[in-house]
Interface confidence: medium
């Protein structure tokens, strides 16, 4: 295994409700600079199972506004542009951390939580149940 | 914009940094009780532009393994179950926040971080560039 | 290959306090949860608590609060379950194992024990 | 506390057999459900995660089912190795809780 030493220069944690609630640095450090630019998103009109964002927001959390798709058929979209019933467009989900501002209204104070997002849609082949 | 009034049971935001840095409780609550028990968790065979799942460890980071979706192929499965190089399977990236342990090694003090990640992958129509 | 590896049987005296070690090898320790499981001879599973050394914060069922402290120093990979208050009804087999905390396939995953010692037999007898 | 009930306590069953073990929780937990399998003196083994998603190297024969109450273990084509007491657990919430075992035999 890694061995990891102790930084000799760590925060105090003698708060009483260390260490649930720890000091956390907000300057976000973004590792995406790398990252197509486009980040796919002229996929969701070019999709077989093409889907739509909606907007949901919510002032107490960080980030405030997440965008979540809905996909637009049950199927898929074959090659004539029709929608084939016979597969099916479904959303991948994902949870994310987000920061929940707690107590609520503090400009300073956060809980982490999970919450689940539908980031895009995928064309499935359907599972059949086949009735005796 | 929305106005939200203080919390007067904020606490005291007289460190230097603020707000840069804030008080996070990392007692995870989960959000997602009521969601679809499936977990997206078998579309990545089940898909038209199936994926693989590649593991990403870094042990300063929270969550320290990600598995990231690499698409199988450059086309898309079709109804014969061959790879249609008409269509193209392309990623579905999504930022997610994590936790970096910042300094190094010290287990209660962080930065939040963005990464972006590939949650699964989608069947696309390509753009055609036509060469005059 | 990720491995769990515990300390020796132990024999005790009613009242004395145990310590057990749990060292793990073959992965990033500090980001994984420690958990400790008992199972008294012919009984289930019973969970004790358990410690996410990246945080450093360990969470203990209610039943051994006050009687049980969970530790993990990173620089050696080694997790320390100590029992203490010791009576007859501790007689059990102690085990460690990992909880996982992963991003798998679009989900936060840290909720399961995927890798287990070999258990710690623990013995309190007057 | 999350209380998990398996059913049945024992289950006794001919090589090549089919097995089923539910478990069933107090309250609704998603799909945060696991199966373990212990054989004689020996540690357990995580078998299922997620209500349905096999663990590292867990042959085919063993699946899972469910969600929010109730769940299914099922073991299709039973092994002689296979004997041994199969556990379901949550991590939904704190304290984890395991359910209080099934033990399988083969005749």
């Known amino acids: 295994g890694i061995t990891i030493p102790r930084n000799p220069g760590c925060p105090n944690s003698e708060d009483k409700n260390f260490p649930r609630t720890v000091m956390v640095n907000l300057n976000i450090h973004n590792r995406n600079t790398n990252t197509n630019p486009k980040r796919s998103s002229d996929y969701y009109n070019r999709s077989t199972s093409p889907w739509n964002l909606h907007r949901n927001e919510d002032p107490e959390r960080y980030p405030s506004v997440i965008w979540e798709a809905k996909c637009r058929h049950l199927g898929c979209i074959n090659a004539d542009g029709n929608v084939d019933y016979h597969m099916n467009s479904v959303p991948i989900q994902q949870e994310i951390l987000v920061l929940r501002r707690e107590p609520p209204h503090c400009p300073n104070s956060f809980r982490l939580e999970k919450i689940l997002v539908s980031v895009g849609c995928t064309c499935v082949t359907p599972i059949v149940h086949h009735v005796a | 914009g929305i106005t939200i009034p203080r919390n007067p049971g904020c606490p005291n935001s007289e460190d230097k940094n603020f707000p840069r840095t804030v008080m996070v409780n990392l007692n995870i609550h989960n959000r997602n009780t009521n969601t679809n028990p499936k977990r997206s968790s078998d579309y990545y065979n089940r898909s038209t532009s199936p994926w693989n799942l590649h593991r990403n460890e870094d042990p300063e980071r929270y969550p320290s393994v990600i598995w990231e979706a690499k698409c199988r192929h450059l086309g898309c499965i079709n109804a014969d179950g061959n790879v249609d190089y008409h269509m193209n399977s392309v990623p579905i990236q999504q930022e997610i926040l994590v936790l970096r342990r910042e300094p190094p090694h010290c287990p209660n003090s962080f930065r939040l971080e963005k990464i972006l990640v590939s949650v699964g992958c989608t069947c696309v129509t390509p753009i055609v560039h036509h060469v005059a | 290959e990720v491995q769990l590896v515990q300390s020796g049987a132990e024999v005790k005296k009613p009242g004395s306090s145990v310590k057990i070690s749990c060292k793990a090898s073959?992965?990033?320790?500090?980001?994984?949860?420690i958990s400790w499981v008992r199972q008294a001879p012919g009984q289930g599973l019973e969970w004790m608590g358990g410690i996410t050394p990246f945080f450093g914060w360990a969470d203990y069922a209610q039943k051994f609060q006050g009687r049980v402290t969970i530790t993990a120093d990173e620089s050696t990979t080694t997790a320390y379950m100590e029992l203490s208050g010791l009576t007859s009804d501790d007689t059990a087999v102690y085990y460690c194992a990992r909880e996982p905390n992963e991003f798998w396939n679009g989900y936060y995953s840290t909720d399961h024990f995927d890798y287990w010692g070999q258990g710690t037999t623990i013995t309190v007898s007057s | 506390e999350i209380v998990l009930t398996q059913s049945p306590d024992f289950q006794s069953v001919t090589p090549k057999g089919k097995v089923t073990i539910t478990c069933r929780a107090s309250?609704?937990?998603?799909?945060?459900l696991h199966w373990y399998q212990q054989k004689p003196d020996q540690s357990p083994k995580l078998l299922i995660k997620?209500?349905?998603h096999s663990g590292s190297g867990v042959p085919s024969r063993f699946s899972g089912s469910g969600s929010g109450t109730d769940f299914t273990l099922t073991i299709n084509g039973l092994e002689a190795e296979d004997a041994g007491t199969y556990y379901c657990?949550?991590?939904?919430?704190?304290?984890?809780?395991f359910g209080q075992g099934t033990k399988v035999d083969i005749k």
């Open positions: 657990h949550q991590g939904f919430s704190l304290p984890h809780t």
């Open positions: 309250q609704d937990i998603g799909s945060e």
């Open positions: 073959g992965g990033s320790f500090g980001s994984y949860g």
């Open positions: 997620y209500a349905s």
